[in-house]
Amino acid sequence: MMTGTIETTGNISAEKGGSIILQCHLSSTTAQVTQVNWEQQDQLLAICNADLGWHISPSFKDRVAPGPGLGLTLQSLTVNDTGEYFCIYHTYPDGTYTGRIFLEVLESSVAEHGARFQIP
């Protein structure tokens, strides 16, 4: 029986050009975590494998950093990074647990501030 639960950071926001840490935590189970997949909608970002360590998708190598822990750091954020992110925990013997995070990437405060004033 799957007794575990995934706690996530839930809905988060960050500034364009900045970075953000995506974190999930599996609790209430003694199951062994064998692998954690990080996905954005249908794109695979990275995999952290208990035996082999981190594997970053070639498409995201320049903008994704492993950690901290089983989390994932997204860098050089763009508005296109807005959306759903999933942490997928493969465990033994329980099976698969999935957590969801919604990230909203906002225009930087400088850009927002500048937009409020019209240049004569």
């Epitope: 995999i47 035996d51 995201f60």
Partner: antibody
Framework: QVQLVESGGGLVQPGGSLRLSCAAS????????MHWVRQAPGKGLEWVAF????????YYADSVKGRFTISRDNSKNTLYLQMNSLRAEDTAVYYC??????????????WGQGTTVTVSS | DVVMTQSPLSLPVSPGEPASISCRSS???????????LNWYLQKPGQSPQLLIY???NRASGVPDRFSGSGSGTDFTLKISRVEAEDVGVYYC?????????FGQGTKVDIK
């Protein structure tokens, strides 16, 4: 470190049977799919069979379907290949190989040293 | 089945010189998740195959950085920037996206 050790190969007559074993260590065997791949003398690599981590799905190359059976015993960290109705063209070195990442399609990272199967009268 | 075609099938190289092997697949290996399920293996004489490159361009652990993989979809390349004596053997590309997984014919690299 990850280690795969095959055994059970040998000389067998056409129509005969053999059971290959692959003892795994150094990783959580019960979490990974496993493959058998073979290599005929002087030839390239040919995939033979795959079994999911929990044994729920098994896939075979057309050339061995109905004759070979892949299985696993997670309590013993061991993979098996039961080979029946053997033919001369089954002569090869048989490798067991580990799925690289958990449930990430059908490719392998670590291979055993191989065991030789010779089918001849 | 996905057919994998390698070229050349034989590649004599002088030590210190670069080498390049091409692999073409009959079907697109780029999954919708953004990953190319294309691996490169090296089988040294008398040994079992060892993984060099996975996901088209990621070097496996412990693989020297003189090895690099590139390409996407149906066309892939393995490059060795400076061949060393220990690099001799047969190089195979393999697609791992579909059952059955399929290998190229192999490219035999030896020292001139």
């Amino acid at each position: 470190q990850v280690q795969l050790v095959e055994s059970g190969g040998g000389l067998v007559q056409p129509g005969g049977s053999l059971r290959l074993s692959c003892a795994a260590s150094g990783f959580t065997f019960s979490s990974y799919g496993m493959h058998w791949v073979r290599q005929a003398p002087g030839k390239g690599l040919e995939w033979v069979a795959f079994i999911r981590y929990d044994g729920s799905n098994k896939y075979y190359a057309d050339s061995v379907k109905g004759r070979f059976t892949i299985s696993r015993d997670n309590s013993k960290n061991t993979l098996y290949l039961q080979m029946n109705s053997l033919r001369a063209e089954d002569t090869a070195v048989y490798y067991c190989a580990k799925e690289m990442l958990v449930q990430d399609y059908y490719y392998m990272d670590v291979w055993g040293q191989g065991t030789t199967v010779t089918v001849s009268s | 089945d996905v057919v994998m075609t390698q070229s050349p099938l034989s590649l004599p190289v002088s030590p210190g010189e670069p080498a390049s092997i091409s692999c073409r697949s009959s079907q697109n290996l780029l999954h919708r998740n953004g990953i190319n399920y294309l691996n490169w293996y090296l089988q040294k004489p008398g040994q079992s195959p060892q993984l060099l490159i996975y996901w088209g361009s990621n070097r496996a652990s412990g693989v020297p950085d003189r090895f690099s993989g590139s390409g996407s979809g149906t066309d892939f390349t393995l490059k060795i920037s400076r061949v060393e004596a220990e690099d001799v053997g047969v190089y195979y590309c393999m697609q791992g996206l579909q059952i059955p997984p399929t290998f190229g014919q192999g490219t035999k690299v030896d020292i001139k």
